[in-house]
C-alpha cells in the first residue's frame, strides 16, 4: 500500500514519541561517535519536517524514501570526515548504495568509554530536572554501544527503565529500589543485543533463506499446535521485520512488529494457547511478551514422520515439486515434535535430510537410498547431547568463575591468535551457560544450552570479522551457520602457533586492583590468564592452576597489606619469577 | 604480634624425628616458610622452605632424601619431618618466616622463632 509521503505514514502509525525515539536510535546506530547533543538536534529536525508533511503530504521532499531523507540529514554533520574517516565517503554514493554503505561501517566494538553508573542520588536529581533528556541519552547510549540492537525493543527497554525511576527515586532506600532494576536490565540488555545480533548476522551473511529455516523451527516449537500455513505466514511476516530492523529501516520494522502482534492476538486461537496473558498488555510489552513466550503444548496423538518423510513413494515427487516448502514442512513437524532439540540442531538434520535427497532422488531406487535416512541423525543428536552432559559436570564440579577459566583454556589454545579481550569476553560469556542452562531439566538443556551457545559465539565471529586474524575462526564462522558451535568444539590445540614473547608488564599489578568489583577483578585475573596461555600454549592445567592459585594469593595478600603498592611491586618480581619456573620457562 | 613458636626438640636417636611450629599473630599462607639450623659453634645453615601453599618446596644438599618440610595452613603450622639423622643434624632449629608468598632467588628471612635444640646421640 504506497503512500504519498512515508515519513508522514510512520509519524501517523508510530505516533510522535517513539517516532523521535527510533529515529535518535537509528541515527545513534549509523554515526557511534557522535555527541548526544548533535543527535538530538537532527531528531528535531527531522521530526519539524516529518511534521509539516503529516500536515501536507504534498509538501517538498516529503515523496522521498526515509533513507534518503535520513542519509542526506547524517551527510549534513559537519565532522565526519575527521570522525569516521572513510564512513564520509558513503555520502557521495545514491540511494541505496549509501545506506548499505552506512551499514557495512556499523561498528561491533566501538572505541566508546565504558558507561559508569553515577550515584543514585546524581542520577535521580537528572532524571527529575529532564525526564526526556535523561531517556533520550540512556536510547543514545545503548544504540550507539549496540548499533544491531532491536530497536522496537529498546523502546520496551527505556520504559522500564523510565518506570524503575519514577518508582525508586521516591522511595526510602532509593539505591536499595533502583540498583537491582537496573543491573537487571543491564544483564538482559546485553542478551537481548546478542541475540538480535545473531538474527542480523544470519540475515547479512546467510541470506534470507538461512532466517527463514531457523524462524520455522523456533516457531514451530513455540506453536506446535499452529498448521505449517500458519507458521508460515508468522515466519514471513517475522523476516520482514527483522530484515528491516537489521538494515537500518527501525520505523518500518516498529510499525511492522506492531502489526504481527496484533495479527498474532487476533488469531491466538489457530496459533498457541499460551497468548492470552501477553495479548493483555500494551504495544511494547505485548511485543516482548509474546517473543518470550512459553512452547505450547504438543498435541496429542501426532503421527510418527516417517510415513510422508521416508516410507510415502512420493517423497521424491513432492520434494521436486517445491523443494523448499517440502524441507519447510519436514523441519515444521520435526520441530513441532522437538521442543528438547536446539534450533541449530533441528537446522542440522533438515540440511542432512534435504542432503540425502538431493543425492537419491537422483539414484536409480530413491527409496532404497533414502530409507535409513532416520539413522544418519542419531549420532547428530548425542553430539550435543554428550557435550551438555560432561560441560555441566564440569560446571557442577568447578562453579560458574573456575568453568570460565577452563574455557578460557580451552578457547586460547585453539585461536590464541584472537586479541585476550575477546577471548575473555566471550569466554565469560560461554561460560555463563553452566548457570543459565545445566539448572534446567534434560528436556530444556539442549535448546538453552546450544541455542545460547550459538548467540556467544556469534559474538566473536562478528569481532572478529572487524580485525580477521585466524583463518581458523573465520572457517569456523562462515562455512555453516548451523554448525559454528561443532566446528569450534571440534578445533584442537592450534599447533602453528608461535607462543607470544614474555613480557613482564602484562602480569604486574596495582593497588588498584584492591578497589576493583569482584567481577572487575576476576576479569583481571582471567587476562592474565588467557596471556599466560597464549605465552606457553602447552602449559598443563595442573600447571596454569597453580600459577592461577599463586596469583590469587598474591592479590589476596597485597590488599590486605598496609603499604599495598610496595607490596604489588616486590611480591609482583617474584610472582612473575614463580610462574616462569612453574611453567618451566 | 608474630609468634614462631617450635617444639620437638631433645635428645633423638639416628633415625627419625618431627619438629614442629605453631604461627600466631599473621595470616598464615601469605608468607612461605623455612627452616634454618644452627651447629654448636657453626654459623647460619638454611635447611629447606617451602612456599605458601606448598606447591614449591627446595632443601639444602645436606639434608636433601632425608627431610621432608610441610605444612598445614588451616592449622596454621609448619613441620619438618628428620629421618636418617645423623650426629651431624645436631643442632638449634628455627622456623622462620620469609617476607614472600614464593621460593624464588635468595630467601628474604623476615621473623624467627627462639629455635628448638636437637640432639642426634646413638
Known amino acids: 500500500d504506497a503512500h504519498k509521503s512515508e515519513v508522514a505514514h510512520r509519524f501517523k502509525d508510530l505516533g510522535e514519541e517513539n517516532f523521535k525515539a527510533l529515529v535518535l536510535i537509528a541515527f545513534a546506530q549509523y554515526l557511534q561517535q557522535c555527541p548526544f547533543e548533535d543527535h538530538v538536534k537532527l531528531v528535531n529536525e527531522v521530526t519539524e519536517f516529518a511534521k509539516t508533511c503529516v500536515a501536507d503530504e504534498s509538501a517538498e521532499n516529503c515523496d522521498k524514501s526515509l533513507h534518503t531523507l535520513f542519509g542526506d540529514k547524517l551527510c549534513t554533520v559537519a565532522t565526519l570526515r575527521e570522525t569516521y574517516g572513510e564512513m564520509a565517503d558513503c555520502c557521495a554514493k545514491q540511494e541505496p548504495e549509501r545506506n548499505e554503505c552506512f551499514l557495512q561501517h556499523k561498528d561491533d566494538n566501538p572505541n566508546l568509554p565504558r558507561l559508569v553508573r553515577p550515584e543514585v542520588d546524581v542520577m535521580c536529581t537528572a532524571f527529575h530536572d529532564n525526564e526526556e533528556t535523561f531517556l533520550k541519552k540512556y536510547l543514545y547510549e545503548i544504540a550507539r554501544r549496540h548499533p544491531y540492537f532491536y530497536a522496537p525493543e529498546l523502546l520496551f527497554f527505556a520504559k522500564r527503565y523510565k518506570a524503575a525511576f519514577t518508582e525508586c527515586c521516591q522511595a526510602a532506600d532509593k539505591a536499595a529500589c533502583l540498583l537491582p532494576k537496573l543491573d537487571e536490565l543491564r544483564d538482559e540488555g546485553k542478551a537481548s543485543s546478542a541475540k538480535q545480533r545473531l538474527k542480523c548476522a544470519s540475515l547479512q551473511k546467510f541470506g534470507e533463506r538461512a532466517f527463514k529455516a531457523w524462524a520455522v523451527a523456533r516457531l514451530s516449537q513455540r506453536f506446535p499446535k499452529a498448521e505449517f500455513a500458519e507458521v508460515s505466514k508468522l515466519v514471513t511476516d517475522l523476516t520482514k521485520v527483522h530484515t528491516e530492523c537489521c538494515h537500518g529501516d527501525l520505523l518500518e520494522c516498529a510499525d511492522d512488529r506492531a502489526d504481527l502482534a496484533k495479527y498474532i492476538c487476533e488469531n491466538q486461537d489457530s496459533i498457541s494457547s499460551k497468548l492470552k496473558e501477553c495479548c493483555e498488555k500494551p504495544l511494547l510489552e505485548k511485543s516482548h511478551c509474546i517473543a518470550e513466550v512459553e512452547n505450547d503444548e504438543m498435541p496429542a496423538d501426532l503421527p510418527s514422520l516417517a510415513a510422508d518423510f521416508v516410507e510415502s513413494k512420493d517423497v521424491c515427487k513432492n520434494y521436486a515439486e517445491a523443494k523448499d516448502v517440502f524441507l519447510g514442512m519436514f523441519l515444521y513437524e520435526y520441530a513441532r515434535r522437538h521442543p528438547d532439540y536446539s534450533v541449530v540442531l533441528l537446522l542440522r538434520l533438515a540440511k542432512t535430510y534435504e542432503t540425502t535427497l538431493e543425492k537419491c532422488c537422483a539414484a536409480a531406487d530413491p527409496h532404497e537410498c533414502y530409507a535409513k535416512v532416520f539413522d544418519e541423525f542419531k549420532p547428530l543428536v548425542e553430539e550435543p547431547q554428550n557435550l551438555i552432559k560432561q560441560n555441566c559436570e564440569l560446571f557442577e564440579q568447578l562453579g560458574e568463575y573456575k568453568f570460565q577459566n577452563a574455557l578460557l583454556v580451552r578457547y586460547t589454545k585453539k585461536v590464541p591468535q584472537v586479541s585476550t579481550p575477546t577471548l575473555v569476553e566471550v569466554s565469560r560469556n560461554l561460560g555463563k551457560v553452566g548457570s543459565k542452562c545445566c539448572k534446567h531439566p534434560e528436556a530444556k538443556r539442549m535448546p538453552c544450552a546450544e541455542d545460547y551457545l550459538s548467540v556467544v559465539l556469534n559474538q566473536l565471529c562478528v569481532l572478529h570479522e572487524k580485525t580477521p586474524v585466524s583463518d581458523r575462526v573465520t572457517k569456523c564462522c562462515t562455512e555453516s551457520l548451523v554448525n559454528r558451535r561443532p566446528c569450534f568444539s571440534a578445533l584442537e590445540v592450534d599447533e602453528t602457533y608461535v607462543p607470544k614473547e614474555f613480557n613482564a608488564e602484562t602480569f604486574t599489578f596495582h593497588a588498584d586492583i584492591c578497589t576493583l568489583s569482584e567481577k572487575e577483578r576476576q576479569i583481571k585475573k582471567q587476562t592474565a590468564l588467557v596471556e599466560l596461555v597464549k605465552h606457553k600454549p602447552k602449559a598443563t592445567k595442573e600447571q596454569l592452576k597453580a600459577v592461577m592459585d599463586d596469583f590469587a594469593a598474591f592479590v589476596e595478600k597485597c590488599c590486605k597489606a598496609d603499604d599495598k603498592e610496595t607490596c604489588f611491586a616486590e611480591e609482583g618480581k617474584k610472582l612473575v619469577a614463580a610462574s616462569q619456573a612453574a611453567l618451566g620457562l | 604480634e608474630v609468634q614462631l613458636v617450635e617444639s620437638g626438640g631433645g635428645l633423638v636417636q639416628p633415625g627419625r624425628s618431627l619438629r614442629s611450629c605453631a604461627a600466631s599473630g599473621f595470616t598464615f599462607h601469605h608468607y612461605a616458610m623455612h627452616w634454618v639450623r644452627q651447629a654448636p659453634g657453626k654459623g647460619l645453615e638454611w635447611v629447606s622452605g617451602?612456599?605458601?601453599?606448598?606447591?614449591?618446596?627446595t632443601y639444602a644438599d645436606s639434608v636433601k632424601g632425608r627431610f621432608t618440610i610441610s605444612r598445614d595452613n588451616a592449622k596454621n603450622s609448619l613441620y619438618l619431618q628428620m629421618n636418617s639423622l645423623r650426629a651431624e643434624d645436631t643442632a638449634l632449629y628455627y622456623c622462620?618466616?620469609?617476607?614472600?608468598?614464593?621460593?624464588?632467588?635468595?630467601?628474604?628471612?623476615?621473623?624467627w622463632g627462639r629455635g628448638t635444640l636437637v640432639t642426634v646421640s646413638s
Open positions: 617451602i612456599s605458601w601453599n606448598g606447591n614449591k618446596i
Open positions: 622462620v618466616r620469609d617476607s614472600s608468598l614464593f621460593i624464588v632467588g635468595a630467601p628474604t628471612f623476615e621473623h
